[in-house]
Interface confidence: low
């Protein structure tokens, strides 16, 4: 099997674990069912539904795979929890009753066309060009609060351009820590901010989002405009929280 | 965790133990001082109410858990598209009533960013207080083990999970068995080290038995959910 067929030279066998970006560093492999790791968040894609019974021991030589959720069954050991366990057990039995001998697949189609975006789980569709355009169109305003993101393992700050319907890195020119704090807040980090720094752009980006410092006191991404140049040739690397680090173990001598 | 090793203090500082009425039920991962990622199937009815849940951080042994950092849960947010039959979109968030104080033993893990490159057999780690063998009891001590990712096309082959794996799931483990997450590990982390940083790639979800040949562990594909996680953090701050 040629694992390496989709990889650029020097990267080796790899796949991009897609969240919701549409850029491919490793081009997608031929589709399988389901198609690898999807480009969109869970609420955006069809959901195949096989029928099976959780928490039933696998019987050898059967074609139905019985699966076990990996939460603890210890809850049912205490006598004071009998009613809770009864409810849990009843749920399991009812689920078990739904087992079909053959796995049944059903595909739900997204309501939205390819030129539209879905408003979270509400099912409303809006044109991609209205996404992050400064006006809320979704019932819960999702189209205006998912306009910044961090990209890749270097935490590159990217902003969505509604005109170009694509994500672009933010140029370091005129950037300051206060904007970093605002971006973190936009993402959902209430009181968290760790670091904001310029790092050399290694993606070979030819387009950027730049700060218009003269714009008034408006939302961060409304201060940003599309530009084909970035004089510092540095992009913003933003970390909202110091995460993913373990303490260095100090050996006693 | 089947086939794992006992964890040392500070090894997995984002790991929390989620208790119901004094009993460990699921694991979870710290992502901010107030937010824990866990599995949606952990908080299904009748356990959907936050009042049932307490989170413990910074302690390795269940028998010593009450000496640890103890936090009541304020909100439980299950993924709106979670399917209890298929375990699709098996992710949930817990907001704590009081923020965690970070130290050497209590720290957050990084949420994965879109565009991260993972090797086809990227080495990942699982951790938890789950059973150390199939149908076993919860472990007193936190265990951890290395498991490689299994590419979705392979995991969906008819010899393994025969198309049960959706894009919202990620498989990890050894196809011959022997190392796996197990009952009681649910909701806990599947992490990988990249660029010197530990990333939350998955949340422990399901599997057919534990550590069986051709039945690797299945995890919620956290990369797919980062957008939803940020949305919830924004909406509930």
């Amino acid at each position: 099997m040629a694992l390496n067929s989709g990889s650029p030279p020097g990267i080796g066998p790899c796949y991009e674990n897609h969240g919701y970006q549409s850029e491919h560093i490793c081009p997608p492999r031929p589709p399988v069912a389901p198609n690898g790791y999807n480009l969109y968040p869970a609420q955006y894609y069809p959901s195949p539904v096989p029928q099976y019974a959780p928490r039933i021991t696998t019987q050898a030589s059967t074609s139905v795979i019985h699966t076990h959720p990996k939460s603890s069954g210890a809850l049912c050991t205490s006598k004071s929890k009998k009613s809770l366990c009864l409810a849990l057990a009843l749920g399991t039995v009812l689920t078990g009753a739904a087992v079909a001998a053959v796995l049944l697949w059903r595909f739900w189609d997204s309501n939205c066309s390819t030129s539209e975006m879905e408003c979270g789980s509400s099912g409303t569709c809006i044109s991609s060009s209205l996404w992050c355009d400064g006006v809320a169109h979704c019932p819960n305003g999702e189209d205006e609060n998912r306009c910044v993101r961090l990209y890749g393992q270097s935490f590159i700050l990217q902003v969505y351009s509604s005109q170009r319907k694509a994500w672009y890195p933010v140029c370091q020119d005129d950037w300051s820590e206060s904007y970093g704090r605002a971006a973190c807040k936009d993402m959902g980090y209430k009181n968290n901010f760790y670091s904001s720094q310029g790092i050399p752009d290694q993606s070979g980006a030819t387009s950027f989002m730049k700060l218009n410092v003269s714009s008034g006191n408006v939302d961060l991404y409304k201060k940003l405009y599309h530009s084909d140049s970035c004089s510092s040739r540095m992009v913003v690397s933003l970390r909202c929280i110091e995460c993913g680090v373990r303490s260095v173990k100090r050996q006693s001598r | 965790i089947v086939g794992g090793l006992n964890a040392s203090p500070g090894d997995w500082p984002w790991q929390v133990s989620l208790h119901v009425q004094g009993v460990h039920v699921c694991g979870g991962s710290i992502i901010t001082p107030e937010w824990i990622v866990t599995a949606a199937h952990c908080v299904e009815e009748p356990l959907s109410s936050p009042r049932y849940w307490t989170a413990f951080a910074g302690i390795l042994r269940q028998s010593l858990m009450f000496y640890g950092s103890r936090h009541q849960v304020e909100k439980v947010i299950s993924h709106p598209n979670y399917d209890s039959k298929t375990k699709n979109n098996d992710i949930a968030l817990m907001k704590l009533q009081t923020p965690l104080a970070f130290n050497d033993l209590v720290k957050p893990v990084c949420l994965p960013n879109p565009g991260m490159m993972l090797d086809l057999d990227q080495e990942c780690w699982i951790s938890g207080w789950g059973a150390t063998y199939e149908k076993g009891k919860t472990s007193d001590v936190l265990n951890a083990a290395m498991v490689p990712l299994i590419e979705p096309s392979k995991c969906n082959s008819k010899y393994i999970y025969n198309n049960l794996i959706t894009p919202a799931m990620i498989c990890a483990g050894f196809l011959q068995g022997s190392v796996d997450s197990c009952q009681g590990d649910s909701g806990g982390p599947l992490v990988t080290l990249k660029n010197g940083i530990w990333w939350l790639i998955g949340d422990t979800s399901w599997g057919s038995g534990c550590a069986k040949a051709l039945r690797p562990g299945v995890y919620g594909n956290v990369t797919v959910f980062t957008d939803w996680i940020y949305q919830q953090m924004r909406a509930n701050s």
């Epitope: - | 290395m146 490689p148 010899y159 011959q176 068995g177 550590a211 051709l214």
Partner: antibody, heavy 121, light 111 residues
Framework: QVQLQQPGAELAKPGASVKLSCKAS????????MHWVKQRPGQGLEWIGL????????NYNEKFKSKATLTVDKSSRTAYMQLSSLTSEDSAVYYC??????????????WGTGTTVTVSS | DIVLTQSPASLAVSLGQRATISCRAS??????????MHWYQQKPGQPPKLLIY???NLESGVPVRFSGSGSGTDFTLNIHPVEEEDAATYYC?????????FGAGTKLELK
């Protein structure tokens, strides 16, 4: 070609320890799990344990948990098994064998040449 | 652990005849269309050699006179026609789960 090379014999005293080696060549060392199997004279085969060379987190047959310790050195492509607190019961031929976890079928397609351990005072 | 019972413990067969060795598992070693049973040949002073994998698949380089069959709990190794070089001990082994276990072995002698 694919080979697992083991020393022919090891002599040890009761109560002592012995460390057996198994040097792999001709294939990607980290792509296969290494297993160890015991065979007493005139007896059958007994599985001791396994070690995935890329992680080092070994798995043991319950019977050998306090007897054997498995390790690997990726740089020299060598797997090791240390046997401790030796008794005459440990006198046997010990084989390393590779198991392709990628194919997942779990058969031993290549065996080491075997090391004869003799425990004698 | 899954226990494998081999029979007979030994058998003597004339050149050119058929040798049949049986292996019974204490529980099924078949799942998802595969039977995780394998057969090895061992000659004195040598390591075991893989003959048959997944119940019926001939390992490359092994003569076609060796064949395997069975599923679930009952498996058979056939050698036909038996040749002089086939005098050896034969073991079955399962890999359905850990620990993998071996049968006690069947010693094949030539009459």
């Amino acid at each position: 070609q694919v080979q697992l090379q083991q020393p022919g014999a090891e002599l040890a005293k009761p109560g002592a320890s012995v460390k057996l080696s198994c040097k792999a060549s001709g294939y990607t060392f980290t792509s296969y799990w290494m297993h160890w199997v015991k065979q007493r004279p005139g007896q059958g085969l007994e599985w001791i344990g396994l070690i995935p060379p890329n992680s080092g987190s070994s798995n043991y047959n319950e019977k050998f948990k306090s007897k054997a310790t498995l390790t690997v050195d990726k740089s020299s492509r060598t797997a090791y098994m240390q046997l401790s607190s030796l008794t005459s019961e440990d006198s046997a031929v010990y084989y390393c064998a590779r198991w392709d976890y990628g194919s997942s079928y779990g058969y031993f397609d290549v065996w080491g040449t075997g090391t004869t351990v003799t425990v004698s005072s | 652990d899954i226990v494998l019972t081999q029979s007979p413990a030994s058998l003597a067969v004339s050149l050119g005849q058929r040798a049949t060795i049986s292996c019974r598992a204490s529980e099924s070693v078949s799942t998802s269309g595969y039977s995780y049973m394998h057969w090895y040949q061992q000659k004195p002073g040598q390591p075991p050699k893989l003959l048959i994998y997944l119940a019926s698949n001939l390992e490359s380089g092994v003569p076609v006179r060796f064949s395997g069959s069975g599923s679930g709990t009952d498996f058979t190794l056939n050698i036909h026609p038996v040749e002089e070089e086939d005098a050896a001990t034969y073991y079955c082994q399962h890999s359905r789960e850990l620990p993998p276990t071996f049968g006690a072995g069947t010693k094949l002698e030539l009459k």
